[in-house]
Interface confidence: medium
């Protein structure tokens, strides 16, 4: 028996359902009584779901997995994972045994889009040319860690004096806070782009600062 899985990682959004595809080619006269199907975590060998002795043995993994029972006889051994969590990310092995056996691993990549960034200024009033301004760009509840880019009003990248921190919450999702310290000219526009590298999703935020005149 030959087991086939998709070579590309399966990308699943947090809280959605994902299908880890796995198939085999049954011989003529194949019956489910002959099938031993095991899904397990590749690294730890933890059992996720199994079909043995002619019946679905159910989920051994947080009761969020299911097979496609009506399709098994056709060679579809795919696994449905419900309400995907960050902790589900990783490699899953589909192990099929009929008379001989084969296995293959499929990778699950979990993702969550970042929120539209909110922009804050410090100080936020009495801004004058030559003043240092701290601009904070905050975006929430994304996964995996974001890439953050700053640009000025002309689209020129701003790489100096940027500090970015990313903290995971209890669900494993990241809140990103990127701080740009700039010197204010007469006026200026500053843009922050938060990119999810898996989803190739960009979230944009910008702020325009108009400096007040200097007085002696």
């Amino acid at each position: 028996v030959e087991v086939q899985v998709s070579e590309d990682p399966v990308v699943a959004l947090v809280d959605t359902d994902a299908t880890l595809r796995c198939s085999f080619s049954p011989e003529p006269g194949f019956s489910l009584a002959q099938l031993n199907l095991i899904w397990q975590l590749t690294d730890t060998k933890q059992l996720v779901h199994s079909f043995t002795e002619g019946r679905d043995q159910g989920s051994a993994y947080s009761n969020r997995t299911a097979l496609f029972p009506d399709l098994l006889v056709q060679g579809n051994a795919s696994l449905r994972l419900q309400r995907v969590r960050v902790t589900d990310e990783g490699s899953y092995t589909c192990f099929v045994s009929i008379q001989d056996f084969d296995s293959a691993a499929v990778s699950l990549q979990v993702a969550a889009p970042y929120s539209k960034p909110s922009m804050t200024l410090e100080p936020n009033k009495d801004l004058r040319p030559g003043n240092m301004v701290t601009i904070t760009c905050s975006s929430y509840q994304g996964y995996p860690e974001a890439e953050v880019f700053w640009k000025d009003g002309q689209g020129v990248p701003l790489t100096g004096n940027v500090t970015t921190s990313q903290m995971a919450n209890e669900r494993g999702l990241f809140d990103v806070h990127s701080v740009l310290r700039v010197v204010l000219g007469a006026n200026g526009t500053y843009s922050c782009l938060v990119r999810n590298p898996v989803l190739q999703q960009d979230a944009h935020g910008s702020v325009t600062i108009t400096g007040q005149p200097l007085t002696f």
Epitope: G130, N131, G160, N161, R181, L214
Partner: nanobody
Framework: DVQLVESGGGLVQPGGSLRLSCAAS????????MGWFRQAPGKGVEWVST????????YYADSVKGRFTISRDNAKNTLYLQLNNLKTEDTAMYYC?????????RGQGTQVTVSS
């Protein structure tokens, strides 16, 4: 008390150069961003340039970009401004300032006059 003393100003012809210095004392110079400002006769105060504490990032007003260069020597507690290709409109009193323009954080100034 913060003390900032500018020097290096003078009379120079258009196209000429000058190097301004600002000797700092009374605070930990290497920890602070520093800036240059200027005030032309009858005009308001204009920001010229700023440098971060380590000296790795510099900022310039559009009017001086490509002609002026700000630098610092943290070992000597000194801020510099190199003025090249001077124009008559650069005539002004030049002040250095600790971080930004505010009372108690700036010097008394050094006069730069550009004239033929």
């Amino acid at each position: 008390d913060v003390q900032l003393v500018e020097s290096g100003g003078g009379l120079v012809q258009p196209g000429g150069s000058l190097r301004l210095s600002c000797a700092a004392s009374g605070f930990t110079f290497s920890r602070y961003w520093m800036g240059w400002f200027r005030q032309a006769p009858g005009k308001g105060v204009e920001w010229v340039s700023t440098i971060n504490s380590g000296g790795g990032s510099t900022y310039y007003a559009d009017s001086v970009k490509g002609r002026f260069t700000i630098s610092r020597d943290n070992a000597k507690n000194t801020l510099y401004l190199q003025l090249n290709n001077l124009k008559t409109e650069d005539t002004a009193m030049y002040y250095c300032a600790k971080e930004q323009w505010r009372t108690g954080s700036r010097g008394q100034g050094t006069q730069v006059t550009v004239s033929s």
